[in-house]
Interface confidence: medium
């Protein structure tokens, strides 16, 4: 992927809207939308006052760890759906899109240098462990996906792209 493709706001916007769409199709869906197990996902809460003052490398650690856990969670959701007796087609479509979207975002972040950033800060080893929550429905899973992209990922790429422009 071109190194700064993710710095084009339209690129991230596409994934944000996909994530929101996925969340919207699960609104009011109970029958098809239970995961039947608790899946660990990243806690997406952002204290923006503190985040704004965090080293970009520390932000990268949080984003990279969160993205890895979220990808794992969505893949687990996909597996559960495949194994269910009658997967609901719209849900299947959005889960597949989320899996593909997270793969692409991982590639785009790697191209931006997020992985290097996440390894290089001296305090990376002593960084606080990633806060997690659990999701037991696809609605919650998609909500976390949407929140993660809208929050930490967008805030980090905005900062990393600005830093790279200097």
């Amino acid at each position: 992927a071109p190194p700064r493709l993710i710095c084009d706001s339209r690129v991230l916007e596409r994934y944000l809207l996909e994530a929101k769409e996925a969340e919207n199709i699960t609104t009011g869906c109970a029958e098809h939308c239970s995961l039947n197990e608790n899946i660990t996902v990243p806690d997406t809460k952002v204290n923006f006052y503190a985040w704004k003052r965090m080293e970009v490398g520390q932000q990268a650690v949080e984003v990279w760890q969160g993205l890895a856990l979220l990808s794992e969670a969505v893949l687990r959701g996909q597996a559960l759906l495949v194994n269910s007796s009658q997967p609901w087609e719209p849900l299947q479509l959005h889960v597949d899109k989320a899996v593909s979207g997270l793969r692409s975002l991982t590639t785009l972040l790697r191209a931006l240098g997020a992985q290097k950033e996440a390894i290089s800060p001296p305090d990376a080893a002593s960084a606080a462990p990633l806060r997690t929550i659990t999701a037991d429905t696809f609605r919650k899973l998609f909500r976390v996906y949407s929140n993660f992209l809208r929050g930490k990922l967008k805030l980090y790429t905005g900062e990393a792209c600005r830093t790279g422009d200097r």
């Epitope: 809460k45 923006f48 919650k140 909500r143």
Partner: antibody, heavy 123, light 108 residues
Framework: QVQLVQSGAEVKKPGSSVKVSCKAS????????ISWVRQAPGQGLEWMGG????????DYAQKFQGRVTITADESTSTAYMELSSLRSEDTAVYYC????????????????WGRGTLVTVSS | SYVLTQPPSVSVAPGKTARITCSGD??????VHWYQQKPGQAPVLVIY???ERPSGIPERFSGSNSGNTATLTISRVEAGDEADYYC???????????FGGGTKLTVL
Amino acid sequence: QVQLVQSGAEVKKPGSSVKVSCKASGGTFRSYAISWVRQAPGQGLEWMGGIDPISGFADYAQKFQGRVTITADESTSTAYMELSSLRSEDTAVYYCARELYYPGTWMAVMAYWGRGTLVTVSS
Amino acid sequence: SYVLTQPPSVSVAPGKTARITCSGDNIPEYYVHWYQQKPGQAPVLVIYRDNERPSGIPERFSGSNSGNTATLTISRVEAGDEADYYCQVFDESSWHWVFGGGTKLTVL
């Protein structure tokens, strides 16, 4: 039940400063950021800035940068907003609002509001 | 910085449905919150994250966000719903909370 009690109305001269207080009760003070929002007579809401009591980090809207200082005193569960170099356009009701993470939000929203403090700037 | 545009006023008869709009560039990309403010009172959060209702807010209040417009819908409007309504987003490019200009809802 969360309550935010603000200091009383103030009349100030142009060029002077005003410091408005906001005392919180109910819930843990340090767990939630406090924002300050103002509303000029007959006008809309305008975010001025806010503070995270845990870190003491404050952030300000561009428009007020350099003129506003937001602080928090954990021992008294009170947040303060000081606005300097006052001019007549600063005549407004100043609200403090406590931010809260609702289920499923990545960012806290302004869930609880004080009743507001009217600041009148007049010579 | 980001701009949210609301109509200055909306009028509706009691029992009917009121729709208050809030437009901005790529607004579906943002999460929109709505506040109600009655004369002489502090604002009250009525919808957060596009379409979620805080506890204590009647089901008559709902929200949506698609196209280039976020909408606050109040069904079966009552006289007590007469107030100013403000939309709000967090604009992370400027790291600021942004409010719309407000819409005065009049119940005829």
